[in-house]
């Protein structure tokens, strides 16, 4: 009679994660008598999956009725898998003894599990930076099987060229994760602009995972600033505004000086916003210049997001209004874009 | 009790080879992996490779491959492990030890042999 | 190859002193990690496997224990049999690796 042969048909199943697997497996005689034991991998480190003797295998169920006699089909189904699951696994019958030995071995079926990539995560710099400078955002995907992945950036739907991107590990694994880090130039345009990461894989059926950055988290728009000094309003007072125009974010301090000395402090409130995301606001100052026998130097000076600050000066010639007798202190009212002149 | 007797010590020339053995009492011989280890002098362990008594297979380090050839003679449970080729790097103490047919965590190098240790001089 | 570092590679300590071993795997091993007890004659033997299940018969006062890819022997209060050399070793997949050993002296 011909010797047993264990016979798996297929060299390689794919599995997505989560559901069964069908292991087929038949042998070619029913001598020797002797159990079916499965294993994952070869050599002294592989795993038993299945004992058809003994054992609970809660995951494992058997395709036919293995405990009838004259079954020669051993096939299981291996429930719930997970990535961890992969490997090559071995229909294997032993020859019935005391212990049972081994007798063999199919040729093994590669099973493959086919996992999702996790939502791409995109973070951008710690710090906030300003147009003009190039800044970094990283995405990363974990958990996907198997390893072959695409990833793209995007910034308002145009794709970006400049970045760096890993699969780890380099090696055999159950599962991959992804890291890629893209270069963005900041423009003073980009306060409701996107960084979009994008990743592609068999298991996403052509709908691929997004993960986006707002890069008003990222940019950081400094104000320009203008002083002028409007028509008197009533004798001896000269009204002076100081536009703080396109900043963003709307954090913004404002400190008027005369002269050098502080006169007041003021915090940007209601803003008007532009188009481009950006702000405006509107200071402004009432001096009386009855109060000053010199010119008066007037400055603007803001503090932006915790910045450095910035400031912008007025001279205001005293010599070109009259003045009050008997009149020594400045009257200033508390102005701002609530209470301006227009 | 599970024993693993291995043979006594070998002083060995270069370019010569040498074979031990390690000789298991006491269970089943054809239901384990027979595994030998090296140790040179003052040094860690090293896994050198195993064999499998019912089939003969056999899986190596492939830093002792072409080095180091195992063998099994089921009928007196005993391993076999030749070293060929010798060299001063040859000089060691060589151990068996054992793990089931399967990775099966209590029966990962229990027992260990008493060691055979080779010494290459010229 | 999976890379099982081991420190530290010597260590001086007192009777009834607490002492921990650490063995760095390079992959994911899971549990599959045996410590290993070797005698000044060269005698092996197992104290730990599956990274934290004490061998029968040896005593209490070993442990091992995990924290993601760092496995710890524990001895808590030295004997003085206790001053000889360990290993590491994971049986994850082949080669099967070794770390590289600690000898415990006596102060």
């Known amino acids: 009679e011909e010797e047993l042969q264990v016979i798996q048909p297929d060299k390689s199943v794919s599995v997505a994660a989560g559901e069964s697997a069908i292991l087929l497996c038949t042998v070619t005689s029913l001598i020797p008598v002797g159990p079916i034991q499965w294993f994952r991998g070869a050599g002294p480190a592989r795993e038993l999956i299945y004992n058809q003797k003994e054992g609970h295998f809660p995951r494992v169920t058997t395709v036919s009725e293995s405990t009838k006699r004259e079954n020669m089909d051993f096939s299981i189904s291996i429930s719930n898998i997970t990535p961890a699951d992969a490997g090559t696994y071995y229909c294997v019958k032993f020859r019935k003894g005391s212990p049972d030995t081994e007798f063999k071995s199919g040729a093994g079926t590669e099973l493959s599990v086919r996992a999702k990539p996790s939502a791409p995560v995109v973070s951008g710099p710690a710090a906030r930076a300003t147009p003009q400078h190039t800044v970094s955002f990283t995405c990363e995907s974990h958990g996907f099987s198997p390893r072959d992945i695409t990833l793209k950036w995007f910034k308002n739907g145009n794709e970006l060229s400049d970045f760096q991107t890993n699969v780890d590990p380099v090696g055999e694994s159950v599962s991959y994760s992804i890291h890629s880090t893209a270069k963005v130039v900041l423009t003073r345009e980009d306060v409701h602009s996107q960084v979009i990461c994008e990743v592609a894989h068999v298991t996403l059926q052509g709908d691929p995972l997004r993960g986006t950055a707002n890069l008003s988290e990222t940019i950081r728009v400094p104000p320009t600033l203008e002083v002028t000094q409007q028509p008197v309003r009533a004798e001896n007072q000269v009204n002076v505004t100081c536009q703080v125009r396109k900043f963003y974010p709307q954090r913004l301090q404002l400190t008027w000086l005369e002269n050098g000395n502080v006169s007041r402090t003021e915090t940007a409130s209601t803003v008007t916003e532009n188009k481009d995301g950006t702000y405006n606001w509107m200071s402004w100052l009432l001096v009386n210049v009855s109060a000053h026998r010199d010119d008066v130097k007037l400055t603007c000076q803001v503090e932006h997001d915790g910045q450095p600050a910035v400031s912008k000066s007025h001279d205001l010639k005293v010599s070109a209004h009259p003045k009050e007798q008997g009149s020594n202190t400045a009257a200033e009212n508390t102005g701002s874009n609530e209470r301006n002149i227009y | 009790e599970v024993q693993f007797q291995q043979s006594g010590t070998v002083l060995a020339r270069p370019g010569t080879s040498v074979k031990m053995s390690c000789k298991a009492s006491g269970s089943t011989f054809t239901s384990y992996w027979m595994h030998w280890v090296k140790q040179g002098p003052g040094q860690g362990l090293q896994w050198i490779g195993a064999?499998?008594?019912?089939?003969?297979?056999?899986t190596y380090n492939q830093k002792f491959k072409g080095k180091a050839e195992l063998t099994v003679v089921t009928s007196t449970s005993t391993a076999y492990m030749e070293v060929s080729s010798l060299t001063n790097e040859d000089s060691a103490v060589y151990y068996c030890?054992?793990?089931?047919?399967?990775?099966?965590?209590?029966?990962?190098?229990?027992?260990w042999g008493q060691g055979t240790l080779v010494t290459v001089s010229a | 190859d999976i890379q099982m570092t081991q420190s530290p590679s010597s260590l001086s300590a007192s009777l009834g002193e607490r002492v921990s071993l650490t063995c760095r795997a390079s992959q994911d091993i899971g549990s599959r990690l045996n410590w290993l007890q070797q005698e000044p004659d060269g005698t092996i033997k197992r104290l730990i496997y599956?990274?934290?299940s004490l061998d029968s018969g040896v005593p209490k006062r070993f442990s091992g224990s995990r924290s993601g890819s760092d496995y710890s022997l524990t001895i808590s209060g030295l004997e003085s049999e206790d001053f000889v050399d360990y290993y590491c070793l994971q049986y994850a997949s082949s080669p099967f690796t070794f770390g590289g050993g600690t000898k415990l002296e006596i102060n």
């Open positions: 064999i499998y008594p019912v089939n003969n297979d056999t």
């Open positions: 030890t054992r793990s089931f047919y399967y990775s099966l965590d209590a029966a990962w190098f229990v027992y």
């Open positions: 599956a990274t934290s």
